[in-house]
């Protein structure tokens, strides 16, 4: 039977019909009482007092309603949940993930996890309704957990008409013996000891460092990973592991040459709620590698949306060469990551100027052969984009990647809903298309337009009459990603390039074939 539920947009928690709850009002000391009525939350302010007993974890401030027994926790930055038990900054799980309290909510199949409080899970052995739910990390959320001491975090997903448990795609903090770091590397305890320039790190207990804050003599040295060694560390919450070095007989510091553990192609996918011509409205967290490129034009004031882009490393964006035919000076370009609405700033978005961009020197503006470009983001350090739930790199494909014909893949972008529309989409969209066999990706299938071996085709293969809403890329999506699932990660297969109209039956979109450019990409990204 269909149940009316309310979803609190601020906290993403769900509530049954007539259920009530308290919620803190962001950036204020006020508290609201909310009530679920016919699928809509109705909220108003209520008076509160300090709790008579501590109920919040991780330094949360507890307040209880003056006239009834409910309480609410004001959580410090980095924590969330009814009792501030959720660590929003946890980027990976340790060991089996029993103590994992992060916000990963995608199963290995790519399915979205079900909220542990969902009534559909009431009869399951593990749900948010258990008396020990808080201790197990379960509650009014859909984040991956390991309450039963299984081998790694898992969740319930709705598949084949029923709810079943599935392991999550949450990254593990230590991938075997790979010497790499997660997040900003605060927890890195590996043995790399060279800086990005190739200099050797000084031991943290070196006499030369006397007077420096971060040395083996620091009272918290052990907790910070400092000691009688010269391994790279990040004791001060910098962008990545670093160390002290002597350069030209001068004491300085440099970032280290430690690879970051790849979380590329992992995302927290949420099922799109709204269909729109040409695709579905989407959230940026489902496509965290999507970039929006804006340009200042010499003739008109302000910036206007130019093209899509794809985050492939902290400081590099891949896009289409044809987007840059106007030869904009790099300082006229802006790249925005983490944005769901095309022209509305997102809460967690990251904005960058462009240091330089490189258009493939054999780009042909007639045929769009070699339609590929790289943009380097401007930054004061060797890191630019900071990984988060809405900003993450896509995986580049292995050189020998050959996906079967008709593999279902997806594209995303802020482009038009249809070819004749005068406007770009106000919100990010996604579209689901299938890879065409090369025999169906030829000039004769595309009105005698030149199709080269550097291109691939993909389109919506569903049948349908004139009213069918076929998925496709459209003007404004150019430069954005065509990604396919490979080895559990979303992998970049194509760059949106060109097409004949948008969403026409049996007319695929044309994409730059990324596997043909892996060496070009690597070559141009060199330090």
């Amino acid at each position: 039977s269909y149940q009316v539920i309310c979803r609190d947009e601020k906290t993403q928690m769900i509530y049954q019909q007539h259920q009530s709850w308290l919620r803190p009002v962001l950036r204020s000391n006020r508290v609201e009482y909310c009530w679920c009525n016919s699928g809509r939350a109705q909220c108003h302010s209520v008076p509160v007092k300090s709790c008579s007993e501590p109920r919040c974890f991780n330094g949360g401030t507890c307040q209880q309603a003056l006239y009834f027994s409910d309480f609410v926790c004001q959580c410090p930055e980095g924590f969330a949940g009814k009792c501030c038990e959720i660590d929003t900054r946890a980027t990976c799980y340790e060991d089996q993930g029993i103590s994992y309290r992060g916000t990963w909510s995608t199963a290995e199949s790519g399915a979205e996890c079900t909220n542990w409080n969902s009534s559909a899970l009431a009869q399951k052995p593990y749900s948010g309704r258990r008396p020990d739910a808080i201790r197990l990390g379960l509650g009014n959320h859909n984040y991956c957990r390991n309450p039963d001491r299984d081998s790694k975090p898992w969740c319930y997903v709705f598949k084949a008409g029923k709810y079943s448990s599935e392991f999550c795609s949450t990254p593990a903090c230590s991938e075997g013996n790979s010497d790499c770091y997660f997040g900003n590397g605060s927890a890195y305890r590996g043995t790399h000891s060279l800086t990005e320039s190739g200099a050797s790190c000084l031991p943290w207990n070196s006499m030369i460092l006397i007077g420096k804050v971060y040395t083996a003599q620091n009272p918290s040295a052990q907790a910070l990973g400092l000691g009688k060694h010269n391994y790279c560390r990040n004791p001060d919450g910098d962008a990545k592991p670093w160390c002290h070095v002597l350069k030209n007989r001068r004491l300085t510091w440099e970032y280290c040459d430690v690879p970051s553990c790849s979380t590329c192609g992992l995302r927290q996918y949420s099922q799109p709620q709204f269909r729109i011509k040409g695709g579905l409205f989407a959230d940026i967290a489902s496509h965290p590698w999507q970039a929006a490129i804006f340009a200042k034009h010499r003739r008109s004031p302000g910036e206007r949306f130019l093209c899509g882009g794809i985050l492939i490393s902290s400081c590099w964006i891949l896009s289409a060469a044809h987007c840059f035919q106007e030869r904009f000076p790099p300082h006229h370009l802006t790249v925005i990551l983490g944005r769901t609405y095309r022209v509305v700033p997102g809460e967690e978005e990251q904005k960058f100027e462009v240091e330089k961009y490189i258009v493939h020197k054999e780009f042909d503006d007639d045929t769009y052969d070699n339609d590929i470009a790289l943009l380097q983001l401007k930054s004061d350090s060797s890191r630019c984009a900071q990984e988060s739930s809405v900003v993450r790199t896509v995986c580049l494909p292995p050189a020998d990647l050959q996906l079967p014909d008709w593999t279902e893949c997806e594209l995303s972008g802020y482009g038009k809903h249809e070819a004749l529309s005068p406007f770009y989409s106000e919100r990010l969209k996604e579209a689901h298309v299938r890879l065409y066999p090369s025999s169906r990706c030829t000039s004769q299938h595309l009105l005698n337009r030149t199709v080269t071996d550097n291109m691939l085709c993909a389109g919506d293969t569903r049948s349908g009459g004139p009213q069918a809403n076929l998925h496709d890329a459209c003007q404004g999506d150019s430069g954005g990603p065509l990604v396919c699932l490979n080895d559990g990660r979303m992998t970049l297969v194509g760059i949106i390039s060109w097409g004949l109209g948008c969403g026409q039956k049996d007319v695929p979109g044309v994409y730059t074939k990324v596997t043909n450019y892996l060496d070009w990409i690597r070559d141009n990204m060199r330090p």
Epitope: D179, H192, S197, G198, D257, V258, P259, K356, I358, K361, L374, Q376, L396, P397, P398, A399, D400, T515, L518, D519, R522, D523, N524, M525, R526, P527
Partner: antibody, heavy 114, light 112 residues
Framework: QVQLVQSGAEVKKPGASVKVSCKAS??????INWVRQATGQGLEWMGR????????GYAQKFQGRVTMTRDTSISTAYMELSSLRSEDTAVYYC?????????WGQGTLVTVSS | DVVMTQSPLSLPVTPGEPASISCRSS???????????LDWYLQKPGQSPQLLIY???NRASGVPDRFSGSGSGTDFTLKISRVEAEDVGVYYC?????????FGGGTKVEIK
Amino acid sequence: QVQLVQSGAEVKKPGASVKVSCKASGNTSYWINWVRQATGQGLEWMGRIDPGGGSTGYAQKFQGRVTMTRDTSISTAYMELSSLRSEDTAVYYCASYYYAMAYWGQGTLVTVSS
Amino acid sequence: DVVMTQSPLSLPVTPGEPASISCRSSQSIVHSNGNTYLDWYLQKPGQSPQLLIYKVSNRASGVPDRFSGSGSGTDFTLKISRVEAEDVGVYYCFQGSHVPWTFGGGTKVEIK
């Protein structure tokens, strides 16, 4: 610190193929380049492979005769040269490239002789 | 292909004296990403080559500061301010900007 250890010397007949391995330890995410040096001669760049994605770039001179591959599970890169001739007798080096070829293997002597 | 021409072919030196090796490329070796990938390598007798200077003028880790690199466009120079006995070997310039990457023919530095 990156360390590169190459396979041992090989003696091959003209027309045969040789496959040289290069095992990396340390940061293994950088290009592996192959450079050869005939006795008493200079250095000659043959090509490169990205150990992560496996993409390659070869010098035109060796195109069609050289194949560079890698096995990420054992952090090893391979260079196979086919249709060997006497002028392929040389020491073959692998070198790891980040900002330059900062780390080199010890070299593998390949002798082509009938 | 970019041809790298080194001079002199042979350089007899006196310990404590300066030395200079020139390298000229047949075309500009500025990469499309704006960097100039001009490196200098030293191959000591019976050893693998070792990196001295990268990207024209950056000294590699552990390389003594008596070695310096300079130049731009097509003309590049490696200087040793005071030659020491351990500096003997063959010095190669190398361009990594255009495929195929190419080495110079080498300059043999030996003690007089």
